[in-house]
């Protein structure tokens, strides 16, 4: 039998990730929920212990007994100022046991206290189990990553956590080192290279500068902000929408924990959407006092909300460069790590800072550290594979896949051109009171209505207990394997009752010619489908332009180049438009376009005057005439409770 593989684990502050190198490539392993990263959360209830997604999903219901951020405690003394500061923000209790911090929770009716190593070991156990479920055999050998700034005590405590989890820790390696390995930067054969790793995760921000020479890694400098990450961006969105709800409905939801939790979930998903789309919709049914909250946000507005946070990421970059005694021109490679580096504005700020230098971002930033750890684990296990760095070229889904929802609407779970294999899950509900079953009708195609798309198959999920409309939760999962075989499963979350259908390439699927025809048809009928999209697009263009102009004239670099009168003129008009937008989200396309042209009439003469002869277009990457039109609306964010 082949030798058991060793795994690489990125033990993160908010999320963890596990990978394995086998058959000449790295596989990042999805958990039982289909997610390739797992929350570093452990929850204790009256009946059970939950780890990962299950723990995070119930955090609002059980905050005192849901533990996260163990990485902020591990290897530290109770009296450490970091521990004392962080404790103020945690809903769970941290107690002092001989100057060692312990987390105190209620578990199965008893008070229990756990060391941070124990909590981390539970997360590591989960990651080990995820790998074992995938590989089909027990796993013991692992490489675990830690931040470059971790001291010996923190490293040893992390290793201990691995041992508690039943792992043989082959090595503790630095997260930035792992990311550099993932990109093969240790094997370029170009002599000494200076690599800057920019790691913006869920809760922390780390900048590291490494020197790599002949396979030897040396950490030259580290900097960062231990409390900056994706969660901060989520908070800005939550605050923004709380204010919007106040404006629209004259009600304050901020004290209602369930409403805020549901809003935060939608905000996190909207944020992710905004990395690939210029607009995201939020649809939360009965958010507060029976009020449905349907709204949207543009990328430009999100960037404005977080502008100070995004800009602040450059300070640690400058500090790391100073500490490493390097000029930015001496950095050979820039590596992006952490989910928040998907944010286009963050990438642009970094790229602009380094004068347009290319960023290493081809590996999923959530997974780069685990990827490198998996490569390192394979090397330490003696894998002599030549193609340790080869990447698998993934196939894609040629058409969107989805199901029919109320009114014959096509709700896509897997978007056209998604790489496969892939798995997507979404919660649906009933349309009528006491509805006994749901008909799951699976379609492929790009049209807004299912009648215009191709029916792949249908099945019924019956036996739903009587309940008012909107109460039952039907979890639908679309899972395409590497061979393009689609499994659709529907599960009633209250009873656990499930039904499924398997759709293979040869059964009801479209040929290449039919796919081509459907894509062309979708183009032909775009006008019908896009009346709404055009409206949103016009809104989008206006909002983006307003925020871009506001940001342009507020740019410190323009001090002295623009008169105060002109600056005021632009800012006043931007404020007028932004406020108008807030109050008129449902205005017509013509109104949005009129406002944009009005704003352009004020801004363009002023802005173009600044950039004429400056060897390039104006701010935001468009010329003096500003952006025309705007891209279509982003994917809708469905409610997830």
């Amino acid at each position: 039998m082949a030798k058991a593989a060793a795994i690489g684990i990125d033990l993160g502050t908010t999320y963890s990730c596990v990978g394995v190198f086998q058959h000449g490539k790295v596989e990042i392993i999805a958990n039982d929920q289909g997610n390739r990263t797992t929350p570093s959360y452990v929850a204790f209830t009256d009946t059970e212990r939950l780890i990962g997604d299950a723990a995070k999903n119930q955090v609002a219901l059980n905050p005192q007994n849901t533990v996260f951020d163990a990485k902020r405690l591990i290897g530290r003394k109770f009296g450490d100022p970091v521990v004392q500061s962080d404790m103020k923000h945690w809903p769970f209790q941290v107690i002092n046991d001989g100057d060692k911090p312990k987390v105190q929770v209620s578990y199965k009716g008893e008070t229990k206290a756990f060391y941070p190593e124990e909590i981390s070991s539970m997360v590591l156990t989960k990651m080990k189990e995820i790998a074992e479920a995938y590989l089909g055999y027990p796993v013991t050998n692992a490489v675990i990553t830690v931040p470059a700034y971790f001291n010996d005590s923190q490293r040893q405590a992390t290793k201990d956590a691995g041992v508690i989890a039943g792992l043989n820790v082959l090595r503790i390696i630095n997260e930035p080192t792992a990311a550099a390995i993932a990109y093969g930067l240790d094997r370029t054969g170009k002599g000494e290279r200076n690599v800057l790793i920019f790691d913006l995760g869920g809760g922390t921000f780390d900048v590291s500068i490494l020197t790599i020479d002949d396979g030897i890694f040396e950490v030259k400098a580290t900097a960062g902000d231990t409390h900056l990450g994706g969660e901060d961006f989520d908070n800005r969105l939550v605050n923004h929408f709380v204010e919007e709800f106040k404006r629209k409905h004259k009600k304050d939801i901020s004290q209602n924990k369930r409403a805020v939790r549901r809003l935060r979930t939608a905000c996190e998903r909207a944020k992710r959407t905004l990395s690939s789309s210029t607009q995201a919709s939020l649809e939360i049914d009965s958010l507060f006092e029976g009020i449905d909250f349907y709204t949207s946000i543009t990328r430009a507005r999100f960037e404005e909300l977080c502008s100070d946070l995004f800009r602040s990421t450059l300070e640690p970059v400058e500090k790391a460069l100073r500490d490493a005694k390097l000029d930015k021109a001496q950095i050979h490679d820039l590596v992006l790590v952490g989910g928040s580096t998907r944010i286009p504005k963050v990438q642009k700020l970094l790229q602009d800072f380094f004068n347009g230098r290319d960023l290493n971002k081809s590996i999923n930033p959530d997974e780069a550290v685990a990827y490198g750890a998996a490569v390192q684990a394979a090397i330490l296990m003696g894998d002599k594979s030549e193609n340790v760095q080869d990447l698998l070229l993934l196939d894609v889904a040629p058409l969107s896949l989805g199901l029919e929802t109320a009114g014959g609407v096509m709700t896509a779970l897997i978007k056209r051109n998604s790489t496969i294999p892939t798995k997507q899950t979404q919660i649906f509900t009933t349309y009528s009171d006491n509805q006994p079953g749901v008909l799951i009708q699976v379609y492929e195609g790009e049209r807004a209505m299912t009648k215009d798309n191709n029916l792949l198959g249908r099945f019924e999920l019956s036996g739903i207990p009587p309940a008012p409309r909107g109460v039952p939760q039907i979890e639908v999962t679309f899972d395409i394997d590497a061979n393009g075989i689609l499994n659709v499963t529907a599960t009633d979350k209250s009873t656990g009752k499930a039904n499924k259908i398997t759709i293979t390439n040869d059964k009801g699927r479209l040929s290449k010619e039919e796919i081509e025809r459907m894509v062309q048809e979708a183009e032909k009928y775009k006008a019908e489908d896009e009346v709404q999209r055009e409206r949103v697009s016009a809104k989008n263009a206006l909002e983006s332009y307003a925020f871009n102009m506001k940001s342009a004239v507020e740019d410190e670099g323009l001090k002295g180049k623009i008169s105060e009168a002109d600056k005021k003129k632009v800012l006043d008009k931007c404020q007028e438009v932004i406020s108008w937008l807030d109050a008129n989200t449902l205005a017509e396309k013509d109104e949005f376009e009129h406002k944009r042209k009005e704003l352009e009439q004020v801004c363009n003469p002023i802005i173009s005057g600044l950039y004429q002869g400056a060897g390039g277009p104006g701010p935001g990457g468009f010329g003096a005439q500003g952006p025309k039109g705007g891209s279509g609306s982003g994917p809708t964010i469905e409610e997830v409770d």
Partner: antibody, heavy 116, light 112 residues
Framework: QIQLVQSGAEVKKPGASVKVSCKAS????????MNWVRQAPGQGLEWMGW????????TYTDDFKGRFTFTTDTSTSTAYMELRSLRSDDTAVYFC?????????WGQGTLVTVSS | EIVLTQSPDSLAVSLGERATINCKSS????????????LAWYQQKAGQSPKLLIY???TRESGVPDRFSGSGSGTDFTLTIDSLQAEDVAVYYC????????FGGGTKVEIK
Amino acid sequence: QIQLVQSGAEVKKPGASVKVSCKASGYTFTNYGMNWVRQAPGQGLEWMGWINTYTGEPTYTDDFKGRFTFTTDTSTSTAYMELRSLRSDDTAVYFCARYDHAMDYWGQGTLVTVSS
Amino acid sequence: EIVLTQSPDSLAVSLGERATINCKSSQSLLNSGTRKNYLAWYQQKAGQSPKLLIYWTSTRESGVPDRFSGSGSGTDFTLTIDSLQAEDVAVYYCKQSYTLYTFGGGTKVEIK
């Protein structure tokens, strides 16, 4: 001083076209939008739309889409309003008006009479 | 589309007396961010082009006599001519610029 000077009165037959000009002076033409307003005999003011003089992008109200075209010539600081397929109910005075916080400067108006 | 309804249609006032013209909007013209109402008033004398009197509800255009004043917020607005002069005989129009632009139907002011 700021002035908007419009072309003279026109008498046209139904089905014909007319092009009214509005020459601006005393300010930077491309810094302000130019609006067009119609006033039928004995009637009130009716906003037709406007043109962004910097980008050349026009905006037409629903009632004035199709037969009407707003254009500019920035080299001569002139805005134009062309009306095709004239009908008798197009008989009116057509005003151009500069827009700052409101329509602060107006042309003297051009009477277009459509009569067979 | 925002509709502006002016009242009365015509008004006869003695010289030196106060003239009051109302303008009602089908929706609020208040921008909560700028705290401005986007309503303007224009004067059109017989055979002449309209002339801007007031914008943003109450800001007088330069050169406009201070007997002209504007007030109101949201949907209800008023133009007041404090002491009517002979040269004030004209048709007065309100116009909104909150979203797109629309004019009211006009109010004719005459001397009684």
